[in-house]
């Protein structure tokens, strides 16, 4: 029959060429002379001329070696025609299958593969995957089936086989325990890919395994003991820099130190921070230290890392002996602000109080005193005893210097240290009121009509405090009572002045004597303008002119 089975031709055939493959034959050749031809890619279309046919015999010819990796299968058509060119058979399909030879080595997709794995992991942990390709056939043959293996490992520490590779997938895994970044930060593996499922051609590449840091090393103090000297009272003073070493990766959370004062800081006097570059612990004073109270502090500082330890590790502790240095401290007034009650107007030379300071220093230093600020110049202070005496009249009613009955004075104490130091204190004199002011009417000028006059109400003020104020009493003197009356209201804080007889238009002096509850008397002259008018007036009208 006019059919042909698929033809298998191995690639890379060595000839000789042309090579006979198969014979096309039509049974119509009994009747007539038959001429054979082939068409299709590989015959009369690109790649042309790979195959040919002997026109009269029908032998299918291969003209050159085949390459399966270029073309794995050719599909041609066979034709049979008579002498006159008429087709005697339908075109016949000819399949030529190129069979594989192992003519390609595996190729790794990269020359160098890079992967990483955390130090200290267990065997079985995957690290990375490598890949090699092989152009040969891996479906019907083993020519293109790649098997992976590890040829060598550098360094060979702690074991010469720290890793293994899945022969089919190329996945590299940890096989041995003991990956330690601090000893071996990187491994270089020479990996092999071998075709024929491990029995053929081999190619190599490099796999670099970076060992990643885990916090498996504790920071250690070096040294562990420190001695420091700090002046007393200094706040924010750098006491000591503590140094640690940590084998983990620098500037990582596994390396960065965290410091904690574990003991010896009962008064919460110290604080410790981490220097961002050096990783040192910077111990500073949070509060001032007091030499007189405690001249030595022994601190215990523990160091850990920002990152938690991945396993149980012993923590390092440092001991810091802090010697507090004595400083000449300023005298301190006791109390810093002293309130003293004193009567206003006490005689000059009269003692007001004693106001002294204490020196925190243990030596018996001499303290001298002086007044630093005495706005009214009312006081003096004994430089030795701190005795404050009056040298001027203390006036409670002096609004320039006294606020809310209090006169404020600043005093200074100075020790005889080298150099001397000073301290200040505030003396708050609460001035006790004395009845030294009489009542005063307001206003002191009035305008009143001489016909049907309106009563004039005057407010009474007294600079003193109760009980040296209302109720007040009023009395007219110097014959003012002939024309005027003066009466204090029921509350006793105003006086009503009335014109009781006709006075011609003019200005008059009304002599009004007011006394307070303590009988302090004050005479005031009221200037009264009497106008020719009726009832209420504020200013006298001008003279009337008729028309």
């Amino acid at each position: 029959d006019w059919v042909v089975a698929p033809i298998s031709v191995p690639e890379n055939g060595k000839g000789p060429f042309p090579q006979r493959l198969n014979q096309l034959k039509s049974n119509k050749d009994r009747d007539t002379k038959i001429f054979y031809s082939i068409t299709g890619p590989g015959a009369d279309s690109p790649p042309e001329g790979v195959f040919a046919v002997e026109k009269e015999t029908g032998w299918l010819l291969l003209n050159k070696p085949l390459d399966r990796e270029e073309i794995a299968k050719y599909e041609l058509f066979g034709h049979a025609v008579s002498e006159n060119g008429a087709s005697v058979e339908d075109p016949m399909n000819i399949s030529i299958i190129v069979t594989d030879q192992n003519d390609h080595k595996p190729k790794f997709t990269q020359d160098t593969f890079r992967g990483s794995v955390l130090e200290g992991v267990l065997p079985g942990t995957s690290v990375m995957q490598v890949t090699a390709t092989d152009e040969d056939d891996a479906i019907y043959t083993y020519n293109g089936v790649v098997a992976y293996s590890i040829h060598s490992q550098e360094p060979k520490d702690p074991h010469d086989l720290m890793f293994t590779i899945h022969r089919s997938t190329g996945t590299i895994s940890v096989i041995s325990s003991g990956l330690d970044r601090e000893k071996v930060p990187e491994y270089t593996l020479t990996i092999q890919a071998t075709d024929m499922d491990g029995d053929g051609s081999t190619t190599t590449a490099v796999a670099v395994v970076e060992i990643l840091d885990a916090n498996d090393n504790a920071p250690m103090f070096d040294p562990q003991k420190y001695e420091a000297h700090v002046p007393e009272n200094a706040v924010g003073h750098e006491v000591q820099r503590l140094t640690v070493t940590d084998l983990d990766a620098p500037n990582s959370p596994a390396w960065r130190a965290t410091y904690l004062i574990m003991g010896g800081d009962d008064g919460d006097h110290f604080t410790i921070t981490t220097h961002p570059e050096s990783n040192q612990g910077i111990l500073t004073t949070r509060k001032g230290l007091d030499f007189e109270a405690k001249n030595q502090h022994t601190l215990y500082v523990e160091v850990t890392n920002e990152a938690p330890f991945v396993l149980k590790l012993p923590t390092s502790t440092a001991t810091i002996v802090v010697h507090v240095e004595d400083v000449n401290e300023a005298p301190v007034f006791v109390p810093p602000s002293k309130v003293v009650e004193v009567q206003e107007g006490i005689p000059t030379g009269e003692p007001v109080c004693v106001y002294t300071a204490e020196d925190p220093d243990k030596e018996n230093q001499k303290i001298s005193y002086r007044i630093l600020r005495d706005p009214a110049g009312w006081l003096a202070m004994d430089p030795d005893s701190g005795q404050v005496t009056a040298v001027g009249t203390l006036d409670r009613e002096d609004e320039q210097f006294v606020r809310n009955n209090i006169y404020e004075v600043m005093v200074l104490a100075m020790d005889n240290g080298s150099p001397p130091t000073t301290g200040t204190g505030t003396l708050l004199l609460t001035l006790i009121d004395v009845n030294d002011h009489g009542p005063v009417p307001e206003p002191r000028q009035i305008t009143i009509c001489n016909q049907s006059p309106v009563r004039q109400v005057l407010n009474i003020t007294d600079k003193d405090l109760s009980p040296h104020t209302s109720p007040f009493q009023a009395q007219l003197t110097d014959d003012s009572d002939i024309y005027w009356t003066a009466e204090v209201n029921e509350e006793g804080d105003t006086v009503v002045l009335s014109l009781k007889k006709f006075l011609k238009q003019d200005t008059y002096d009304v002599h009004l004597s007011l006394s307070d509850h303590g009988n302090k008397e004050q005479l005031t002259v009221i200037r009264a303008t009497v106008c020719d008018c009726h009832g209420h007036v504020e200013t006298c009208p001008g003279p009337w002119k008729g028309g």
Epitope: L122, S168, S177, D180, D216, L311
Partner: antibody, heavy 117, light 111 residues
Framework: EVQLLESGGGLVQPGGSLRLSCAAS????????MSWVRQAPGKGLEWVSA????????YYADSVKGRFTISRDNSKNTLYLQMNSLRAEDTAVYYC??????????WGQGTMVTVSS | QSALTQPASVSGSPGQSITISCTGT?????????VSWYQQHPGKAPKLILS???KRPSGVSNRFSGSKSGNTASLSISGLQAEDEADYYC???????????FGGGTKLTVL
């Protein structure tokens, strides 16, 4: 001589706890991953748990996950297995073994754990 | 159900040779050359007799040998002796957190 010696086995009620120890000698203990492998009476070997040389990494079989805790103290050359919420099916001889890099060697002599009411 | 499959039992007469198979998958036995074999006498702890498919630790008789083909590993014992009667377990490395697999064990009887 390389040696592993287990202790701590015994009879315990279901739901109870037990702590096994394995003392190592004759080799650099901290350089090796260690495992616990158990064998129920008349049955085969079953891997239970593993811990890395540093102690920073651990594995557990699904059957014991959440109930057993493996740990080690390299300063004492000792491996531990804390077993909580014990069940009847945990009854077995428990062996500690050192991972040699693809195989277990050596093995301890084993300690018997019986979970029964 | 064990991860690796072994015959439950094999037997042989003294002087004979026997082979115990251990079948896994392409992700364990087939993937790595880390098949090991352990011998366990009754009441005793397992003892390593072969590592890395065919490597004998010192002190192990050369009558024990190992091989691997595809996903199946084999333990061969030649010149069978009475003291070889024991249980034999194969084991294979596999990646992941179930990093080691055991076979169900094979009871060897020396007739």
């Amino acid at each position: 001589e390389v040696q592993l010696l287990e202790s701590g086995g015994g009879l315990v009620q279901p739901g109870g706890s037990l702590r096994l120890s394995c003392a190592a000698s004759g080799f650099t203990f901290s350089s090796y991953a260690m495992s616990w492998v158990r064998q129920a009476p008349g049955k085969g070997l079953e891997w239970v748990s593993a811990i890395s040389g540093s102690g920073g990494s651990t594995y557990y079989a699904d059957s014991v996950k959440g109930r057993f805790t493996i740990s080690r103290d390299n300063s004492k050359n000792t491996l531990y297995l804390q077993m909580n919420s014990l069940r009847a099916e945990d009854t077995a001889v428990y062996y500690c073994a050192s991972w040699g890099g693809g195989w277990f060697d050596p093995w301890g002599q084993g300690t018997m754990v019986t979970v029964s009411s | 159900q064990s991860a690796l499959t072994q015959p439950a039992s094999v037997s042989g007469s003294p002087g004979q040779s026997i082979t115990i198979s251990c079948t896994g998958t392409s992700n364990d036995v087939g993937a790595y050359n880390y098949v090991s074999w352990y011998q366990q006498h009754p009441g005793k702890a397992p003892k390593l007799i072969l590592s890395e498919v065919n490597k004998r630790p010192s002190g192990v008789s050369n009558r024990f040998s190992g091989s691997k083909s595809g996903n199946t590993a084999s333990l061969s014992i030649s010149g069978l002796q009475a003291e070889d009667e024991a249980d034999y377990y194969c084991s294979s490395f596999t990646s992941g957190d179930h990093w080691v697999l055991f076979g169900g064990g094979t009871k060897l009887t020396v007739l």
